[in-house]
């Protein structure tokens, strides 16, 4: 009998938004207020997430899906499903244990969130710095000086007048 029952589990008929109520002879009961089940065949409903404090509700909880939170102005989400809210900083800064601090020389942050990242090393790509970096902006890389020799440009082909092995001064 148990084997037959497991093959025809009455709980498998309970749709999302309900749970299989053992206290009521495995009848499908609606999820109580402030709870949900996002899949069928559940034996319990999960408690809805509550967006409190610095969290605010982006999507209300329903009987079939959890609430979704985001952060109040001046804060931003971290992690999956906005697990945490973290204080914004200004561009050119990052949040440290002691609050918002300016990016160190050689690093930048162009957003109000995240960390200061190193400026791009143009020379790794055989390029040179076209525009210097700041705390708020990455460097802009451009052709290396060798590529900008007289008679050469990014549009016209290089003039054929140069001797092999001769580098511009």
């Amino acid at each position: 009998f148990e084997r037959t029952r497991s093959l025809q589990d009455p709980c498998s008929n309970c749709p999302a938004g309900t749970f299989c109520d053992n206290n009521r002879n495995q009848i499908c009961s609606p999820c109580p207020p402030n709870s949900f089940s996002s899949a069928g065949g559940q034996r319990t409903c999960d408690i809805c997430r509550q967006c409190k404090g610095v969290f605010r509700t982006r999507k209300e909880c329903s009987s079939t899906s959890n609430a979704e939170c985001d952060c109040t102005p001046g804060f931003h989400c971290l992690g999956a499903g906005c697990s945490m809210c973290e204080q914004d900083c200004k561009q050119g800064q990052e949040l440290t244990k002691k609050g918002c601090k300016d990016c160190c020389f050689g690093t930048f942050n162009d957003q109000k969130r995240g960390i200061c990242r190193p400026w791009t090393n143009c020379s790794l790509d055989g390029k040179s710095v076209l525009v210097n970096g700041t705390k708020e902006r990455d460097v802009v890389c451009g052709p290396s000086p060798a590529d900008l020799s007289p008679g050469a440009s990014s549009v016209t082909p290089p003039a054929p007048a140069r001797e092999p092995g001769h580098s511009p001064q």
């Epitope: 931003h76 989400c77 971290l78 992690g79 999956a80 973290e86 990052e94 949040l95 440290t96 244990k97 957003q111 969130r113 995240g114 960390i115 990242r117």
Partner: nanobody, 115 residues
Framework: QVQLVESGGGLVQAGGSLRLSCAAS??????MFWYRQPQGKQREYVAH???????NYADSVTGRFTISRGNNDNTMYLQMDNLKPQDTAVYYC???????????WGQGTQVTVSS
């Protein structure tokens, strides 16, 4: 490409300890997280650590779990002490990129605490 690899899970008796590790590669990460998912339940936040050492814990693990980051910045640990049967779950390492706009995930490591 980004890779997060967890290790250190296993079977332990209640009151015991485990140390989980997460090795991340392929990007700069601003924040690294531990999440866990007990069987048949929702995934839940455990703890996180930022690149400059700020930490935070879920109430259920505060005082028992300690999160830390290795010297190379892309390794993270979770020291779990005084483990309880309700800590049984698959533990996932996750990491936000430098701009906190994308979260990457590891494959998970099973932690089972027997009573």
């Amino acid at each position: 490409q980004v890779q997060l690899v967890e290790s250190g899970g296993g079977l332990v008796q209640a009151g015991g300890s485990l140390r989980l590790s997460c090795a991340a590669s392929g990007d700069i990460f601003s924040i690294m997280f531990w999440y866990r998912q007990p069987q048949g339940k929702q995934r839940e936040y455990v703890a996180h650590i930022t690149s400059n050492g700020r930490t935070n814990y879920a109430d259920s693990v505060t005082g028992r779990f300690t999160i830390s980051r290795g010297n190379n910045d892309n390794t993270m640990y979770l020291q779990m002490d005084n483990l309880k049967p309700q800590d049984t779950a698959v533990y996932y390492c996750a990491a936000d990129d430098a701009t906190n706009t994308r979260t990457y995930w590891g494959q998970g490591t099973q932690v089972t605490v027997s009573s």
